[in-house]
Interface confidence: medium
């Protein structure tokens, strides 16, 4: 999946995850992902997105919440919650990649 086009210059985002090389990153958009694996506490990661924009369409479930935004450091103060409203198979963008 190519980088999302027509967004103009890259955006700077807060980066807080094991994959971060520093406190910020640059990408086509910013992300906050809250994931709860079975038997573990939810883990929240902040970073940059370049691929699979369709994931941004997914609404919260009891296991994952994937939020995207497009402005400078827009993911810095976003605090996500998990909401048991959909099963994972109902998330958008899963028919083809």
């Amino acid at each position: 999946d190519p980088v999302k086009p027509s967004r103009g210059p890259l955006v700077t985002c807060t980066c807080e995850s094991p994959h971060c090389r520093g406190p910020t990153c640059q990408g086509a958009w910013c992300t906050v992902v809250l994931v709860r694996e079975e038997g573990r506490h939810p883990q929240e990661h902040r970073g940059c997105g370049n691929l699979h924009r369709e994931l941004c369409r997914g609404r919260p479930t009891e296991f994952v919440n994937h939020y995207c935004c497009d402005s400078h450091l827009c993911n810095r103060n976003v605090s996500l919650v998990l909401e048991a409203t959909q099963t994972p198979s109902e998330q958008p963008g899963t028919d083809s990649q």
Partner: antibody, heavy 120, light 113 residues
């Protein structure tokens, strides 16, 4: 001004495949800012969303139609298409193509719609 | 699927009077993390495609007259036409874009009394 225009046969025989194309003008279908949908409206009835496609080719289909639906995109022609297989009289409807903003916000541009009748 | 139920199915209102259309979703369409309601309203006149009026439950689309307003909470929503005009005669639909598949209400027909 963005415009969408549906085209395709107005009459399809039962068990055959309905094929429609939506041509987008006044804007690029390759923009990552939008998703492109097909929606239908049975005569005198409400609206039923069929599915969407993103510029990358990723799709999502209404589960009620998923086994019969294919949506594809041709960015070089600024078009996206709908194929609905094994049609019956129940598929007789006005078919609309529409544009949806990336972050949601509803369908802001629609085609005029094309009536497809399924009959032998 | 989220079921959208509108009421009434039709209503007749005198010119210049207020028209109120209700829409109820079978589950919440509020994305609480970002406090946004994933609900839109459309107007459809005979022989025309639907026209977007309101999105995010209460934001008017550009060019839509300010006599149209939307309000509501997680599951109960209202479209209000503050002073009905002759050109407002149409069918109005609510639409949720929170959970796929996107779904619409059955429509409310607004006529002049």
């Amino acid at each position: 001004q963005v415009q969408l225009q549906e085209s395709g046969p107005g009459l399809v025989k039962p068990s055959q495949t309905l094929s429609l194309t939506c041509t987008v003008s006044g804007g690029s279908i390759s923009s990552g800012d939008y998703y492109w949908s097909w929606i239908r409206q049975h005569p005198g009835k409400g609206l039923e969303w069929i599915g969407y496609i993103y510029y990358s080719g990723s799709t999502y289909y209404n589960p009620s139609l998923k086994s019969r639906v294919t949506i594809s995109i041709d960015t070089s022609k600024n078009q996206f298409s709908l194929k609905l297989s094994s049609v019956t009289a129940a598929d007789t409807a006005v078919y609309y193509c529409a544009r949806e903003r990336d972050y949601g916000g509803g369908f802001d541009y629609w085609g005029q719609g094309t009536l497809v009748t399924v009959s032998s | 699927d989220i079921v959208m139920t509108q009421s009434p199915d039709s209503l007749a209102v005198s010119l210049g009077e207020r028209a109120t259309i209700n829409c109820k979703s079978s589950q919440s369409v509020l994305y609480s993390s970002i406090n946004k309601i994933y609900l839109a309203w459309y107007q459809q006149k005979p022989g025309q495609p639907p026209k977007l009026l309101i999105y995010w439950a209460s934001t008017r689309e550009s060019g839509v007259p300010d006599r149209f307003s939307g309000s509501g909470s997680g599951t109960d929503f209202t479209l209000t036409i503050s002073s009905l005009q002759a050109e407002d005669v149409a069918v109005y639909y609510c639409h949720q874009y929170y959970s796929t598949p996107w779904t619409f209400g059955q429509g409310t027909k607004v006529e002049i009394k």
